[in-house]
């Protein structure tokens, strides 16, 4: 049969409120070496159990009888420390248990999830959460909005998520937990109303270095908007903005555009390149959510101005020209020059030279027409650039090199009759 | 010395539920927890879960939640574990085990086959 | 909850032999417990509180470790211990066991 227990005081019970400080304790009488005192809370060993021990002996012999004490400090009561308590030690071959103490928690509500502050576009519907527990239980919730009760008594409403259909000025929540104890108030959330994001974000139209673009702005409760904001960005290759990014990977060009009109030019943009933009409208609650980002392009342009360098000279019944690129934007993609030149009393001759940048012209009359000018234009899908101003065709002198080149013959009949070519040409002399 | 008897085999069929009793000797049963560790064939230990005699209280592992209940009999030192809808997966030998922060004393096991 | 992984699964040593059986949990432990069970009967504790030998059992078990690693020795190895070996922990709820080793004897 078994020995008779050496425990001779039990651990008591304890019941509190969350955050109570309490100490269990219990003492058992022992012959020879004290055993370690071990804690068991509903059957498992405490492992950081906050527990002292104080041994004394009742005698001057090692062998005499000892009295142990273990106290276990319970520092700071929550609901994980409620249960059955019990001293557990291990004597010899055998293993003895005190009887157990119970160590439970009951006060007002305690709140696992509170009312958080968020902003809500206007009108818009958003949920609510609030999570309080006891014991003792039933924990019942009441809502309250700006204050007042959203039910008529605890528990009848809605009780872990309030389901607000929209809001169109900002408001405050807070939820009331009520058990047999008394009542707790969760913290006050704020819900801050803002404008709806914008719709409808479009282009109007487009110049080589400026976009017209316009919205429709959403609801924003009873709060007048005050500006609009329009952000473009270059939309780079492997920027992206196409895959959702969310901001852009580089300084946007940001304009504010005062409200109605919901209306916007963007000015000193590229020519002939790709954007993306999107817009977000503020209240004097705060901004609204930016649309998505909006692919635009500028369009083509024509250059901005005359190729430079350009050097003419005549040997005989052959003209040489050659020129540079233009130093000014060329606003798209060059497609080519075109030349005109012209005598004092011949009419002038158009000539589209594509992209290369020299031509030798072969003269009709052995070169003997007088005061020869030369023109160059260069031009992109949207039309030719400014011409250069004349530049007269000078003689060859020996020693000036002549760069083979392909001659560019006129027709023998008419003189000086060359097609014009269906493009702009600006007279310039 | 302390000693743990349980019931003998069952067969039971799909659906049917199945109660294993562990008879405690040479201890105070009420101070003690009682567990239950079940293994299937050729496999590991698996905790059930406790009651403690001396109250009634219980704690079941989350597996076997809504389908097992431990009981006592204070006055014959028994302490019982029911496990319904039985399923053929539930084949296993079924240990009860005293428990003082680990299992020192173990019953000799109680068969319980899950065949239709 | 915490897994336990023992190594090796399956052991086959000559008696006289030292044999070490680790437990690995999954996350930090206290203490842990090992059981043996030899076959067609029910586990018997070896070793409570990591270090302390059960009511019974020979000097030539022990047990050892901390944190996540854990290690049961058998000193010099006899016929009686051939046996399925269990490592088990109660730091938290539920408690687990380890798969198991079993010890086959040469």
């Known amino acids: 049969q078994a020995e008779e227990s050496p425990f001779v005081g039990n651990p008591g019970n304890i019941t509190g409120a969350r955050g109570l400080t309490g100490t269990l304790r219990c003492q058992l009488q022992v012959q020879g070496e004290p055993p370690e005192v071990h804690w068991l809370r509903d059957g498992q060993i405490l492992e950081l159990a906050d527990s002292t021990q104080t041994q004394v002996p009742l005698g001057e012999d090692e062998q005499d009888d000892w009295i142990v004490v273990s106290q276990l400090r319970i520092t700071s009561l929550q609901l994980s420390d409620t249960g059955q308590y019990q001293c557990l030690v291990f004597l010899g071959h055998q293993t003895f248990v005190s009887q157990p103490g119970y160590v439970g928690l009951e006060g007002l509500p305690y709140f696992l999830e509170e009312p958080e502050d968020r902003t809500v576009a206007a009108n818009t519907p958003f949920n609510l959460s609030c999570q309080a527990q006891g014991p003792p239980e039933p924990v019942d919730l009441l809502w309250l909005q700006d204050a007042v009760p959203l039910a008529t008594a605890p528990g009848h409403g809605p009780q872990r998520s309030l389901h607000v259909p929209g809001l169109n000025k900002t408001s405050s929540f807070s939820c009331e937990a009520h058990n047999a104890k008394g009542v707790t108030t969760s913290r006050t959330a704020t819900i801050t109303v803002l404008p709806q994001q914008p719709r409808n974000l479009h282009l109007v139209s487009r110049q080589p270095t400026e976009l017209e673009v316009a919205w429709t702005p959403g609801l924003s409760g009873i709060y007048p908007l005050t500006h609009c904001t329009l952000q473009a960005v270059l939309s780079d290759d492997g920027m992206g903005i196409q895959a959702g990014e969310p901001d852009p990977p580089e300084e946007p060009l940001t304009s504010q555009a005062s409200v109605p009109p919901h209306q916007l030019r963007l000015g000193s943009l590229h020519p002939h390149t790709p954007y993306h933009i999107r817009v977000a409208c503020t209240s004097s609650q705060g901004p609204s959510s930016w649309t998505h980002w909006l692919p635009v392009e500028t369009p083509e342009g024509v250059p901005l101005g005359p190729p430079e360098n350009i050097s003419a000279t005549r040997n005989g019944s052959q003209a040489f020209v050659h020129w540079q690129e233009p130093r000014a934007p060329l606003q798209g993609t060059l497609l080519g020059y075109r030349l005109a030149y012209q005598g004092q009393d011949t009419p002038e001759v158009l000539m589209d030279i594509g992209l290369r940048q020299e031509v030798t012209l072969e003269l009709q009359g052995d070169g003997s027409v007088s005061n020869l000018t030369v023109c160059v234009a260069a031009y992109t899908a949207a039309g030719d650039g400014p011409w250069s101003l004349p530049v007269p065709l000078e003689a060859w002198r020996p020693g000036q090199a002549q760069p083979v080149h392909q001659l560019v013959k006129e027709p023998s009949t008419p003189a000086f009759s060359w097609p014009h070519h269906h493009h702009h040409h600006h007279h310039h002399h | 010395q302390v000693q743990l008897v349980q019931s003998g085999a069952e067969v039971k069929k799909p659906g049917a539920s199945v109660k294993v009793s562990c008879k405690a000797s040479g201890y105070p049963f009420t101070d003690f927890y009682i567990n239950w560790v079940r293994q299937a064939p050729g496999q590991g230990l698996e905790w059930m879960g406790w009651?403690?005699?001396?109250?009634?209280?219980?704690k079941y592992n989350e597996k076997f939640k809504g389908r097992v209940t431990m009981t006592r009999d204070t006055s014959i030192s028994t302490a019982y574990m029911e496990l319904s809808r039985l399923r053929s997966d539930d084949t296993a030998v079924y240990y009860c085990?005293?428990?003082?922060?680990?299992?020192?004393?173990w019953g000799q096991g109680t068969l319980v086959t899950v065949s239709s | 909850q915490i897994v336990l992984t023992q190594s090796p699964d399956f052991q086959s040593v000559t008696p006289k032999e030292k044999v070490t059986i680790t437990c690995s949990a999954s996350?930090?432990?206290?203490?842990m417990y090992w059981y043996q069970q030899k076959p067609d009967q029910s586990p018997k504790s070896l070793i409570y509180l990591t270090s302390n030998l059960a009511s019974g059992v020979p000097s030539r078990f022990s047990g050892s470790g901390s944190g996540t690693d854990y290690t049961l020795t058998i000193n010099s190895l006899e016929a009686e211990d051939a046996a399925t070996y269990y490592c088990?922990?109660?730091?938290?709820?539920?408690?687990?066991f380890g798969q198991g080793t079993k010890l086959e004897i040469k």
């Open positions: 009651i403690y005699p001396g109250s009634g209280n219980t």
């Open positions: 996350s930090s432990i206290g203490y």
């Open positions: 088990q922990q109660w730091s938290s709820n539920p408690p687990t």
């Open positions: 085990a005293r428990s003082t922060g680990f299992f020192d004393y």
